[in-house]
């Protein structure tokens, strides 16, 4: 039993890091493998992650972490029984994938303006709370070409757009994702999408 693709990990910079790797053949990850991880810190304790299958030869493990900060560094040991298959390290702050924003809502009761709001996925005491920027994707269910991205570079988790920038009388969907420049993160996953019917009064034409 050998590791074909070494574990690569990403952190949500809050409580979970996800590591994925591939074995050289079909493997029952949960029964045959264990990923041990330990913070390189005084008084830290070793933890064991039981991996799940991710395709035939792929494995994935969700590492639970407390109080993630930039100085943290973890040792990782992948074991198959008594055999050490791989040894490595992981610094969560250097491999951040933010959590997806939640609670995306479209408020259509403001005159001729669409207000989209969503929730910041981090608590106020987390460093990323004040450093997320967002991308909002709006698309038409009827017209695949009607697809647009709005970049939200301010901190407030909201976006206002004129209803007239979208077609009237048809349904649209929106979703939002986040990233943080400070840690050069990847984009988060998209939030679940929300749907609304866009209708506004066309200005009277002479």
């Amino acid at each position: 039993m050998k590791v074909l693709q070494e574990p690569t990990c990403v952190s949500d910079y809050m409580s979970i890091s996800t590591c994925e790797w591939k074995m050289n053949g079909p493997t029952n990850c949960s029964t045959e493998l264990r990923l041990l991880y330990q913070l390189v810190f005084l008084l830290s304790e070793a933890h064991t992650c039981i991996p799940e299958n991710n395709g035939g030869a792929g494995c994935v493990c969700h590492l639970l972490m407390d109080d993630v900060v930039s100085a943290d560094n973890y040792t990782l040991d992948l074991w198959a029984g008594q055999q050490l298959l791989w040894k490595g390290s992981f610094k969560p702050s250097e491999h951040v994938k933010p959590r997806a924003p939640g609670n995306l809502t479209v408020h259509t009761n403001v005159s001729d303006t669409l207000l989209l709001t969503w929730s910041n996925p981090y608590p106020p005491d987390n460093y990323l709370y004040n450093h997320l920027t967002y991308a909002v994707n709006i698309w038409s269910e009827n017209d695949p070409a009607d697809f647009r991205i709005y970049n939200v570079t301010y901190l407030e988790p909201s976006l206002r757009i004129a209803a007239s920038t979208l077609k009237s009388g048809i349904s649209y969907r929106a979703r939002v994702r986040a990233w943080a420049q400070c840690y050069n993160t990847t984009w988060s996953e998209w939030s679940p999408s929300t749907k609304w019917h866009n209708s506004y009064r066309e200005p009277f034409e002479q």
Epitope: L42, L43, E45, D66, D67, V69, S70, A71
Partner: antibody, heavy 116, light 111 residues
């Protein structure tokens, strides 16, 4: 919000022991290390030691080795710092502080006076 | 214990800028991150800067930190009378044993 509530002021005689408590609330108690530091009147801050509330393991500054003991009670989310063989120069305000590499939140402090 | 050295006192007028230095020999500052604490008269210390230059939520951007080599600096711009306090730098060291040294402390007076 995070709160670290410390026990009240103490007056002790030289040679005695003192046990200061620090009750934590507003966060997951076992997820954050706790430090203890002290500050003598008109002096600077001095680090004393650290405890991991999850397992209860501790590490102390060399200066206090053999004289200090840090413990915790997870059922009440409380950490304790006991200092023995007290001397007049141990007169200080003792602080608990939540954190790992740096101290995010501090208790208000407990004044311990050692006097004959 | 490792010793981090700060100037005993600094002073400046309201609205001015002031800097406080923190230097430490050995591996303490050079290999670690620096934090800064503000202690207003009669109160407990409060975290002002961590990770060399990051501010906790609620700390005004008038406070900033930097680090170069084995020394660190706290800068305060637009001084206010409410900034009058003692300021301490802090770090951690892992050699020969783990410890968390603090700086000697600096008294800031706003003239």
């Amino acid at each position: 919000q995070v709160q670290l509530v410390q026990s009240g002021a103490e007056v002790k005689k030289p040679g005695a022991s003192v046990k200061v408590s620090c009750k934590a609330s507003g966060y997951a108690f076992t997820s954050y290390y706790m430090h203890w530091a002290r500050q003598a009147p008109g002096q600077g801050l001095e680090w004393m030691g650290i405890i991991n509330p999850r397992g209860g393991s501790t590490s102390y500054a060399q200066k206090f080795q053999g004289r200090v003991a840090m413990t915790r009670d997870t059922s009440t989310s409380t950490v304790y710092m006991e200092l023995s063989s007290l001397r007049p120069e141990d007169t200080a305000v003792y602080y608990c502080a939540r954190g790992k590499y740096w101290m995010y939140d501090w208790g208000k402090g407990t004044l311990v006076t050692v006097s004959s | 214990q490792s010793v981090l050295t700060q100037p005993p006192s600094v002073s400046a007028a309201p609205g001015q800028k002031v800097t406080i230095s923190c230097s430490g020999g050995g591996s303490s500052i050079g290999n670690s991150y620096v934090s800064w604490y503000q202690q207003l008269p009669g109160t407990a210390p409060k975290l002002l800067i961590y990770d060399n230059n990051k501010r906790p939520s609620g700390v005004p951007d008038r406070f900033s930190g930097s680090k170069s080599g084995t020394s660190a600096t706290l800068a305060i711009t637009g001084l206010q009378t409410g900034d009058e306090a003692d300021y301490y730098c802090g770090t951690w060291d892992t050699s020969p044993v783990w410890e968390w040294p603090f700086g000697t402390g600096t008294k800031l007076t706003v003239l």
